[in-house]
Interface confidence: medium
């Protein structure tokens, strides 16, 4: 006899990286017939929703109107059908960005290289942080961590055309509080396509849409929450 229900999916809309003072919605998708959903934050009960009518609804939304560092952290959700509770969802790391300062991102030897050459990104921030994150915009969320007193280096090693794209970095004051994003650096790599079918190029975005760029990063994001769940839970591990 089944003692628990399958775990729900959890994700953030429009994005799990939320600029300070902006709004975000945490979504939890369970099963039709669920009479109660609970959202947990850092291990404690944070909010409860009871959908009406439960047999017609399989998703609830928890709205955060004004993101700040106290709201940043790890969220999970569970749901109940009758007296039976589900397994908890995977953890969603909700990050607040645009905190304090803006790092500077540079690339060596330069923004244009030939395939096979070694490339290193440098992210510099003079305020008190020792962790840095390098993100490549586009279809998949490539995130690297780096450490250093005021600067971290991110060696990409010998690059291929797969490294083409637009990069930004953040300083991280803790796992869930990040700086403003750096200005973008576009890396252009001259070389051969690795596979016979060239994937469409990663889209690039102007600075003012950075806060929503990951909306397009996972294929079928709105339909396949498992993908999003994975991205969110793996990003900060």
């Amino acid at each position: 006899q089944q003692q628990t229900l399958p775990k729900p999916f959890i994700w953030a809309e429009p994005h799990f990286m939320v600029p300070k003072e902006k709004q975000v919605t945490i979504c939890c998708q369970g099963n039709y017939g669920a009479v109660e959903y609970q959202l947990h934050f850092e291990g404690s009960l944070f909010a409860v929703d009871r959908p009406k009518p439960p047999e017609r609804i399989n998703k609830v939304q928890f709205y955060i109107p004004d993101m700040n560092s106290r709201m940043a952290g790890q969220y999970s959700c569970i749901y109940r059908v009758g007296e039976l509770w589900s397994e908890p969802s995977n953890l969603l790391d909700l990050v607040v960005t645009e905190m304090y300062d803006t790092p500077t991102l540079s690339v060596h030897p330069g923004p244009e290289v030939i395939s096979g050459e070694k490339v290193t990104f440098y992210c510099r921030l003079d305020t008190a942080t020792s962790m840095f994150l390098l993100l490549k915009e586009g279809r998949s969320s490539h995130v690297q961590r780096g450490y250093g007193k005021v600067q971290a280096e991110f060696p990409l090693g010998p690059v291929t055309t797969a490294h083409r794209g637009t990069y930004r970095c953040f300083g991280s004051y803790n796992n869930h509080a990040w700086s403003f994003p750096s200005e973008p650096v576009k890396l252009l790599v001259t070389g051969d396509i690795e596979n016979t079918s060239l994937a469409p190029e990663d889209p690039t975005f102007p600075a003012d849409t950075w806060g929503t760029y990951l909306l397009t990063t996972e294929t079928g994001l709105q339909k396949d929450h498992a993908l999003w769940d994975h991205t969110a839970q793996n990003l900060l591990r």
């Epitope: 030897p109 330069g110 923004p111 244009e112 290289v113 030939i114 096979g116 050459e117 055309t161 576009k186 252009l188 001259t190 070389g191 051969d192 396509i193 016979t196 079918s197 060239l198 994937a199 469409p200 190029e201």
Partner: antibody, heavy 118, light 107 residues
Framework: QVQLQQSGAELVRPGTSVKVSCKAS????????IDWVKQRPGQGLEWIGV????????KYNEKFQGKATLTADKSSSTAYMQLSSLTSEDSAVYFC???????????WGQGTLVTVSA | DIQMTQSPSSLSASLGERVSLTCRAS??????LNWLQQEPDGTIKRLIY???SLDSGVPKRFSGSRSGSDYSLTISSLESEDFVDYYC?????????FGGGTKLEIK
């Protein structure tokens, strides 16, 4: 503003070699690749190869491997293309070009006419 | 190597007319395509990059688009200085390759 100033026209003998220069100004020379392109009289364009002035790294179109040698001198912000064992097939206008944040071949030199004739 | 087949090779048109030039790529090149303009004195200028983005200073009558493996340059209303040569160029994969060119002549 970005400028690529190429050396003047050359009249050379078959079997010899020639070195075409492309002097860059208006930007940090080592930050952008320089591509070279060939255009035979009344014909289309062919990509010869590319050099990274910062590292000296090169990549060639196989068709021009052994024919063209690309180098760069950081101190003078100049890229060079040497063509060896010249034949009449090498008579052409040669262009250098530079990319930008927005992709390849953003800026072009004015072209250098190389004529191979006995 | 990726082949770029450009058509037509020459085109006669009148001032004010709308014209389109096409390049077909033999393999998928994504959006890595430029359109170049070459003056009679040999000067080359990039008009369009990344398939559809207009270079700064290029008149708005020029536009680029894509349908599958076909890439188009459209001039909405021809002006006298537009009657020159045009080339497409793919920079998705080396060796980079050019279309054969289109000579645009005044009718």
């Amino acid at each position: 503003q970005v400028q690529l100033q190429q050396s003047g026209a050359e009249l050379v003998r078959p079997g010899t070699s020639v070195k075409v220069s492309c002097k860059a100004s208006g930007y940090p020379f080592t930050s952008y690749l320089i591509d070279w392109v060939k255009q035979r009289p009344g014909q289309g364009l062919e990509w010869i190869g590319v050099i990274n002035p910062g590292s000296g790294g090169t990549k060639y179109n196989e068709k021009f491997q052994g024919k063209a040698t690309l180098t760069a001198d950081k101190s003078s912000s100049t890229a060079y293309m040497q063509l060896s064992s010249l034949t009449s097939e090498d008579s052409a206008v040669y262009f250098c070009a530079r990319g930008g944040w927005d992709g390849k071949f953003t800026y072009w030199g004015q072209g250098t006419l190389v004529t191979v004739s006995a | 190597d990726i082949q770029m087949t450009q058509s037509p090779s020459s085109l006669s048109a009148s001032l004010g007319e709308r014209v389109s030039l096409t390049c077909r790529a033999s393999q998928d090149i994504g959006s890595s395509l430029n359109w170049l303009q070459q003056e009679p004195d040999g000067t080359i200028k990039r008009l369009i990059y990344a398939t559809s983005s207009l270079d700064s200073g290029v008149p708005k009558r020029f536009s680029g688009s894509r349908s599958g493996s076909d890439y188009s340059l459209t001039i909405s209303s021809l002006e006298s200085e537009d009657f020159v040569d045009y080339y497409c160029l793919q920079y998705a994969s080396s060796p980079y390759t050019f279309g054969g060119g289109t000579k645009l002549e005044i009718k």
